[in-house]
């Protein structure tokens, strides 16, 4: 006997005293297990266990199945085994039909024999087809067929376990092997969008789309900084061996102000983890935000173009929109549309289109904009820059000469006085009054300056010049006056453009 | 050639020692389980003991008449059994097989010629 | 200890016959039973083992039977070199111990 302390427990003997032993079918096995503290024997094999609490195990008419691992156990947990092949030439084989490997693993064929002393225990191609070159294995007669290192090439091999038995090829059944795929990537995880917006007591519902090589890959939803489980409903397609989706659907029935924030769809497999993000903004009611895309002051020159851009924010939908100058509604000249196409997108833009702006077209111009929740609008200030215009020049009864002319923005006159028959009137002449008139209406249309001097103080005959400018331009308009003897006479006046 | 040659038998007197040996040949020594058997002159078959291989742990097993007296032992590096005798009596007289058994079943498929031992004063 | 016990110790028969040796266990030993064939100053030769499966080599005229514990060897037609002592051995328990031998003699 193996060699021990005394008083130290030693595992039970078993009769026959063989690691392995064959028996004939329709034999009896019997088998003796010798303990002072025998407690059971067990007996294994593929998936099936029995057990028998005599010392004695006797099986009277022994069959294949009868093919296995017999243990004794002692009350120390100290135990021995016998391995015991019932030799049956119609049943070479026990089998377990399924057969799973995981991929860069071993998985077995699991297709013990009755009979140990059979020849050329390996695998064959089923029908005759040869395996995968690469294909290597280790037969044991007690387990099966070890296939080494499993390839996603092998999914769906077809295979026999395979001996000879006097001469001749003997076949199992046929065993079809699945295989796991080994995780070599990340999951792919993508969301339906990357953005909500929504108004309390609407759905949300999000779907995240997981794809990977197999089934076993985890996902879930999560809300960032919070623990709370949350309810997903799943949907999974195999698109071919190794091409598995999975799209989790999140959905929140009537969403509230604070379900805003975050959500993650994480997913993991045993190579690694991803995810991905979408952020939900509950709103207790709708709105829209206008930006300007120009200063709303605008200032263009008589006869040129200016475009009014607005971009705005509008949740939901824009419903209706104008631009309006002076209570008129533009049917035309103006185009809205949507800043990306985008399914989240809230964002639009409105462009009015003025063309060759006269002086009276200045103005405030207004842009509206509707949805089912709120109004909202911008005005823009536009003021026409337009070259002096002198209306009148009159010398008024009282000695007066005066000079009225219109423009933006607000002209300057000034005097000159031409002795003699000069062109060039350089001498300047201060003005006794100046008044800028109709200054109570909105500042948008032409500004009018009156500006007078006294002709008194002309003592010779020569020209006088009015010459009214701003920003765009000038425009003069010229007394002329004649001395017959103490007479002042005023000869028509003219004027003189000067661009 | 498959073969067992038993060696190391002689004449020995009562109360002394001795060991036999058994060289193997032909076959994988390592694998199989070894028996001493022997065999009193004019007399049958006596089982002495027997040795298990590794897979069985090496276990020894004895017959009552020679237990404590005689230990079985192996070499598997040099293809050997051996049997030493102790204490010996003069109905240890005998001629000494060694046998082998199969690895499915305890019988004896191959057998030494057998070494004569003699215990006598 | 299990008893083995042989029966007859010996016999005559003639080349030809047909020898019935019989072997009983003192207790039930399945089929773990051996036959062995001894000639005079040679070591015994395996014949039958687990009761009734023929030893590679040995002529098919030699066959074994029973099962618990008792056991029949038969030589169905008795040939000159079959002169010889034949032994039962059981294997199920140790000590595996030999029956008495039976000799068959020239008649």
């Known amino acids: 006997q193996p060699s021990v302390s005394p008083g130290e427990p030693s595992p039970p003997s078993i009769h026959p005293g063989k690691s392995d032993l064959i028996v004939r079918v329709g034999d009896e096995i019997r088998l003796l297990c010798t303990d002072p503290g025998f407690v059971k024997w067990t007996f294994e094999i593929l998936d099936e266990t029995n057990e028998n609490k005599q010392n004695e195990w006797i099986t009277e008419k022994a069959e294949a199945t009868n093919t296995g691992k017999y243990t004794c156990t002692n009350k120390h947990g100290l135990s021995n085994s016998i391995y015991v092949f019932v030799r049956d030439p119609a049943k070479l084989f026990l089998v377990d039909r399924s057969l799973y490997g995981k991929e860069d693993n071993d998985t077995l064929v699991r297709c013990p024999l009755t009979d140990p002393e059979v020849t050329n225990y390996s695998l064959k191609g089923c029908q005759g087809k040869p395996l995968p070159k690469d294909l290597r294995f280790i037969p044991d007669p007690k387990a099966g067929i070890m296939i080494k290192s499993v390839k996603r090439a092998y999914h769906r091999l077809c295979l026999h376990c395979s001996v000879d038995q006097e001469g001749k090829s003997v076949l199992s059944e046929k065993f079809i092997l699945k295989v796991r795929p080994a995780f070599k990537a990340v999951p792919v995880v993508s969301v339906s969008k990357a953005s909500y917006l929504l108004r309390e007591g609407e759905e949300f519902t999000v779907t995240c789309t997981i794809k990977d090589v197999s089934s076993s890959v985890y996902s879930t939803w999560k809300r960032e900084n919070s623990q709370t489980k949350l309810q997903e409903k799943y949907n999974s397609w195999h698109h071919g061996d190794f091409n598995y989706e999975r799209q989790a659907t999140l959905t929140i029935s009537s969403a509230r102000v604070n379900d805003s924030g975050v959500f993650m769809c994480y997913a993991n497999n045993t190579f690694g983890s991803a995810n991905v993000t979408t952020t939900l903004e509950v709103v207790d009611k709708g709105f829209i935000n206008i930006f300007p895309m120009i200063n709303t002051t605008v200032f263009v020159n008589d006869g040129e173009n200016v475009d009014l851009i607005v971009e705005y924010e509008a949740f939901p939908k824009p419903e209706h929109q104008q631009w309006i100058y002076m209570n008129r509604t533009f049917t035309d000249k103006w185009e809205d549309y949507p800043k990306s196409e985008n399914e989240s997108n809230i964002r639009y833009v409105s462009e009015l289109h003025l063309t060759r702006l006269k002086g009276t077209e200045g103005g405030t111009y207004t842009f509206l904009v509707s949805n089912s929740d709120v109004n909202a609008a911008i005005a823009f200030n536009v003021y026409v820059n337009t070259k002096p215009e002198i209306l009148t020049y009159d010398r008024l009864v009282n000695g007066m000469l005066q000079c009225v002319a219109a423009g933006f923005p607000e002209p300057t006159i000034d005097w000159y006085f031409c002795p003699g028959t000069e062109q060039r009137c350089s001498a300047s002449v201060l003005p006794v009054d100046v008044q800028t008139l109709n200054s109570s209406g909105p500042p948008f249309g032409k500004l009018v300056v009156q500006s007078s001097i006294d002709s008194s103080a002309f003592k010779h005959n020569g020209t006088v010049e009015c010459k009214a400018y701003n920003d765009v331009g000038k425009t003069s308009a010229y007394f002329n006056f004649a001395f017959k003897g103490n007479n002042k006479e005023q000869i028509h006046p003219h004027t003189l453009f000067t661009p | 050639e498959v073969q067992l040659v038993e060696s190391g038998g002689g004449l020995v007197q009562p109360g002394g020692s001795l060991r036999l040996s058994c060289a193997a040949s032909g076959f994988t020594f390592s694998d199989a389980d070894m028996d001493w058997v022997r065999q009193a002159p004019g007399k049958g078959l006596e089982w002495v003991g027997r040795?298990?291989?590794?897979?069985?742990?090496?276990?020894?097993e004895y017959a009552a008449s020679v237990k404590g007296r005689f230990t079985i032992s192996r070499d598997d590096s040099k293809n050997s059994l051996y049997l030493q005798m102790n204490s010996l009596k003069t109905e240890d007289t005998a001629v000494y097989y060694c046998?082998?058994?199969?690895?499915?079943?305890?019988?004896?498929?191959?057998w030494g010629r057998g070494t004569l031992v003699t215990v006598s004063s | 200890d299990i008893q083995m016990t042989q029966s007859p110790s010996s016999l005559s028969a003639s080349v030809g016959d047909r020898v019935t040796i019989t072997c009983r266990a003192s207790q039930s030993i399945s089929s773990y039973l051996n036959w062995y064939q001894q000639k005079p100053g040679k070591a015994p030769k395996l014949l039958i083992y687990?009761?009734?499966s023929l030893q590679s080599g040995v002529p098919s005229r030699f066959s074994g039977s029973g099962s618990g514990t008792d056991f029949t060897l038969t030589i169905s037609s008795l040939q000159p070199e079959d002169f010889a002592t034949y032994y039962c051995q059981q294997s199920y328990i140790a000590p595996y111990t030999f029956g008495g031998g039976t000799k068959v003699e020239i008649k």
């Open positions: 687990a009761a009734s």
């Open positions: 046998a082998r058994e199969p690895k499915y079943w305890i019988d004896f498929d191959l």
């Open positions: 040795t298990r291989n590794k897979a069985g742990s090496y276990t020894t």
